[in-house]
Interface confidence: medium
């Protein structure tokens, strides 16, 4: 998937310092064997840059090749950087691995926003700071590209954690994690921690600080306060999820639920924007507008074409609204709202004309694919990628940015009627198109 | 440096269409807006719609609604500006220019313009 | 829409003399304003953007003042180069983008 507009990463503020955080093993779920136990190897495992996406240290091959890898969850094919390229400090060396194999099969792969092609293989692979297996897993050596590499994002490939069916060439490429589970006794589960900065970071300061976890196998209860609600992962090809209603401060967008998830809504690492549909963006963007109406805002913000600064330290958090999304539960009629801050939806970023200032993006965007759920979203949760169970789970983030007045939040159960009616049924045709455009 | 050229000058037909392209190159393009602004000979310049390539949506000013397309392909950092049901009026030069990444969203990079000529 | 109205149409000023050129917004757009300068033949090079600041490589000769509805260019000292149109933009509320309808600077 692109990797878009992407939020700034560090360990961010309101939890635990991460360097100090460890599991706590006595409140695990009993009736989940194998998800017990120490994760304290994964946490803080993450790192990224603003706007460039978070990325996880793999090795491919032998001898092993250290790589930055992108974390996206809105794709399914595990590929990098096989050839030279100018934004490429290292890259998949095959001819230097002994236990290569080449599958003699190409795959080339489009975004809006440039492409990849290369060949595709097999290697072994493993996560240093993950579980401690090594797997035998499809790669994409990327020979050619336009656009798809960030100068300076230091990460050198692309880790797609959806299913199969958006595997490009085809669904018959099985993705990593399916062959990790496969090949190992690591359960069909991931969690990602996903902690914004709140403010823009140099390069130096990216490379000194912490991005998040992504705890493969597990749920580590040191990332998140409260308690864990799950939602049914609707269909399992991008991780599709019901949204069956949206407030702004409370008030109900009153909107026919199917116009949420038109035509469909997925929880997506690789993309940084709430993205919505039309319809909705212009409802929320209206109500989000008259929320802070106490002060003024060029259109261009709220359309993402410009920005709005406040003298450092002054940005006024209490005049936006927080937005809540409520979803389908795992019990029948009845739903959870997850609720974000002005903190997630606006993106601090560096005004090009002047760096005086804290300046902000407004980091909600019209769609024309659905609902994404991007880094806005997921910074202010803990997210459980239960595949086993075929479910999502969302917690507050133990490192999500907020202030002393409000803090992110996940609430239930709430009595919803006719959720089964909010999800969109997409006409059968090609549906093997990879999302792009993904701001 | 960021540059923005623009395809080549244009002679249509009243009710007939053009489509004129600007490329970028030098900088990014995706998350930057481009506007589209027009000024018949002798007059001065009007604003017809911007888009942000990344999200793919267009805003367009009320006079040109319904006969104005913009639009942008990422792979080739190239926006495209359509006008349909031309008449001797739309006789002007078209310029694509950048905003974006500021406060203040200004106009900073201009294209060299594309003269169209509407003439039976 | 917000109607950008400036004035004079035409400034008659000799080299080396101040211009002031006068831009008014029919409601207030804060700060959001630009100026440009347009030379025959060419596309317009921007001044001057949130009202007052000078943009890359603008000579100090040029200086912007004003915000709600009434905003001023000021070109302290002009030289030969500095004969063209200079238009202003509200970038505040829209679609549209208003320009205002310019006014010509010509030698005196």
């Known amino acids: 998937t692109q990797h878009g507009i992407r939020l700034p990463l560090r360990s961010g503020l309101g939890g635990a310092p991460l360097g100090l955080r460890l599991p706590r093993e006595t409140d695990e779920e009993p009736e989940e064997p194998g998800r017990r136990g120490s994760f304290v190897e994964m946490v803080d495992n993450l790192r990224g840059k603003s706007g460039q996406g978070y990325y996880v240290e793999m090795t491919v091959g032998s001898p092993p090749q250290t790589l930055n890898i992108l974390v996206d969850t809105g794709s399914s094919n595990f590929a990098v950087g096989a050839a030279p390229h100018p934004f490429l400090h290292r890259y998949y060396q095959r001819q230097l691995s002994s236990t290569y194999r080449d599958l003699r099969k190409g795959v080339y792969v489009p975004y809006t926003q440039g492409k990849w092609e290369g060949e595709l293989g097999t290697d072994l692979v493993s996560i240093p700071h993950g579980p401690n297996v090594t797997v035998r897993a499809n790669i994409a050596a990327i020979t050619e590209s336009d656009k798809f590499f960030i100068n300076g994002s230091n990460w050198e490939g692309i880790l797609g954690l959806a299913y199969a069916e958006i595997a490009r060439p085809d669904d018959s490429l099985e993705p990593f994690f399916d062959s990790l589970v496969k090949q190992t006794h690591v359960p069909n589960l991931f969690s990602l921690q996903l902690c914004g900065a709140g403010f823009p970071l140099n390069q130096s300061e990216v490379l000194a600080s912490v991005g998040g976890s992504m705890i493969i196998g597990g749920i580590d209860h040191s990332l998140y306060t409260g308690s864990l609600w799950y939602t049914p992962i609707r269909r399992e090809w991008y991780y599709e999820v019901i949204i069956v209603r949206v407030e702004i401060n409370g008030q109900d967008l009153k909107m026919d639920c199917k116009e949420y998830n038109y035509d469909k809504s997925i929880v997506d690492s690789g993309t940084t924007n709430l993205r919505l549909p039309k319809k909705v963006f212009e409802a929320a963007v209206k109500s989000i507008k008259a929320a802070s109406s106490t002060e003024k805002f060029p259109d261009g913000f709220w359309l993402g074409e410009q920005l709005v600064c406040w003298q450092a330290g002054t940005t006024p958090w209490n005049i936006f609204p927080v937005i809540s999304l409520y979803l389908m539960g795992e019990v029948t009629n009845q739903s959870f709202r997850i609720t974000i801050l002005p903190q997630q939806y606006l993106r601090p970023v560096e005004d090009v004309a002047t760096s005086q200032d804290d300046c902000y993006k407004f980091a909600i965007s019209q769609s024309s694919t659905g609902t994404v759920m991007g880094a806005v979203i997921m910074e202010g949760f803990y997210v459980v990628f239960d595949r086993a169970r075929k479910r999502i789970g969302f917690a507050v983030s133990a490192c999500h940015v907020h202030d002393e007045f409000r803090t992110a939040a996940v609430e239930g159960p709430f009595v919803t009627l006719d959720m089964e009616d909010c999800g969109y049924n997409i006409p059968q045709t090609d549906e093997s198109t990879l999302m792009t455009g993904r701001a | 440096q960021v540059q923005l050229v623009q395809s080549g000058a244009e002679v249509k037909k009243p009710g007939s269409s053009v489509k004129v392209s600007c490329k970028a190159s030098g900088g990014t393009f995706s998350s930057y807006a481009i506007s589209w602004v027009r000024q018949a000979p002798g007059q001065g310049l009007e604003w017809m719609g911007s888009?942000?390539?990344?999200?793919?949506?267009?805003n367009y000013a009320q006079k040109f609604q319904g006969r104005v397309t913009i639009t942008a392909d990422e792979s080739t950092s190239t926006a495209y500006m359509e006008l349909s049901s031309l008449r001797s009026e739309d006789t002007a030069v078209y310029y694509c220019a950048r905003s974006g990444g500021t406060k203040y969203g200004m106009l900073d990079v201009w294209g060299q313009g594309t003269m169209v000529t509407v003439s039976s | 829409e917000i109607v950008m109205t400036q004035s004079p149409a035409t400034l008659s000023v000799s080299p080396g003399e101040r211009a002031t050129l006068s831009c008014r917004a029919s409601?207030?757009?804060?700060?959001?304003l630009a100026w440009y300068q347009q030379k025959p033949g060419q596309a317009p090079r921007l001044l001057i953007y949130?009202?007052?600041t000078r943009a890359t490589g603008i000579p100090a000769r040029f200086s912007g003042s004003g915000s709600g509805t009434e905003f001023t260019l000021t070109i302290s000292s002009l030289q030969s180069e500095d004969f063209a149109v200079y238009y202003c933009q509200q970038l505040y509320t829209w679609p549209p983008r208003t320009f205002g309808g310019g006014t010509k600077v010509e030698i005196k």
């Open positions: 949130g009202a007052s």
């Open positions: 409601q207030s757009v804060g700060s959001n």
């Open positions: 888009i942000i390539p990344i999200f793919g949506t267009a």
